[in-house]
């Protein structure tokens, strides 16, 4: 099946201090390689989460990514702050014969708006 990375929401709004879910699904796990979430694009993009076993404070996977046929790579960001605002991209990589892996497809991006916490 042809690989497609889908981020269904173009944007989400979340109150500061709350949690938000950023959805991402794949149509294929091939070619093998990691899935990572970034905020922003280009050289200055920031790694938010990687499905390769490392620990990321405040960010967790939504579904059980250890399922061998898992296609859901959605993440939950907890205790959102204004600094978390920006556009988040779910990115599929193909493993490389040497570092780094090759980016092969990105979702369309989900913009996160952080609303002031109601007083």
């Amino acid at each position: 099946k042809e690989l497609k990375v889908t981020q269904p929401e173009k944007s989400v709004s979340v109150a500061a201090g709350d949690s938000t879910v950023l959805n991402c699904t794949l149509t294929s796990l091939l070619p093998v390689g990691p899935i990572k979430w970034y905020r922003g694009v280009g050289q200055s993009r920031l790694l938010i989460y990687s499905f390769t076993g490392e620990h990321f404070p405040r960010v967790t996977n939504v579904s059980d990514a250890t399922k061998r046929n898992n296609m859901d790579f959605s993440i939950r960001i907890s205790n959102v702050t204004p600094e978390d605002a920006g556009t988040y991209y779910c990115v599929k990589f193909q493993k490389g014969p040497s570092e780094p892996d090759t980016e092969i497809q990105s979702g369309g991006g989900t913009e996160v708006y952080v609303l002031a916490k109601p007083s």
């Epitope: 091939l30 070619p31 390769t52 076993g53 059980d64 250890t66 046929n69 493993k95 040497s98 570092e99």
Partner: antibody, heavy 118, light 107 residues
Framework: DLQLVESGGGVVRPGESLRLSCAAS????????MSWVRQAPGKGLEWLAG????????YYIDSVKGRFTISRDNSKNSLYLQMNSLTAEDTAVYYC???????????WGLGTLVTVSS | ALTQPASVSANPGETVKIICSGG??????YGWYQQKSPGSAPVTVI????KRPSDIPSRFSGSASGSAATLTITGVRVEDEAVYFC???????????FGAGTTLTVL
Amino acid sequence: DLQLVESGGGVVRPGESLRLSCAASGFTFSSYAMSWVRQAPGKGLEWLAGISAGGSDTYYIDSVKGRFTISRDNSKNSLYLQMNSLTAEDTAVYYCARETWNHLFDYWGLGTLVTVSS
Amino acid sequence: ALTQPASVSANPGETVKIICSGGDYYSTYYGWYQQKSPGSAPVTVIHSDDKRPSDIPSRFSGSASGSAATLTITGVRVEDEAVYFCGAYDGRTYINTFGAGTTLTVL
């Protein structure tokens, strides 16, 4: 310190059943997929079965499908292998192993010996 | 099936390469497992083609390309004498497989 300790091995007769256990410590067991791998005397390693972190998804090599069942109890940090209708060909050391994110193995238990003999 | 040589030998300080072939690069990740005696617990020396666990010496390295993976031991030591199994996970079939093992003798 990360530890995987298998138990439940022993001598059984052909056709009998055995349940192996693997006690995990030193890591967040509920976050990792796990597998069982065996090694027959004088032979190489053979992967048998794997289970997702939550326990809902299981995977088997064809030769043990329907006879062996992998399961886990995350509240007890334990992995299990139920083995039915055992034959002499199942004689081996059985290892539990922790899976990496891409379903290879990073840590192994010391193994438990299963001998099937009449 | 994964294919690897039955045995290799080297003098201390030499570089050893063990090649494991038979996987499909598009769908396969490789690992390497060291077993010092039959029935003893395997030790992972490489996973994810080229990732070395933190407690494994830097003389062990791995690579993969095409349909093969390579374990390289640079400056082999007597204590590296063991059987080395290559292993693979196939993302197409969801199955793990192992090679038959390579016995490394350090002369």
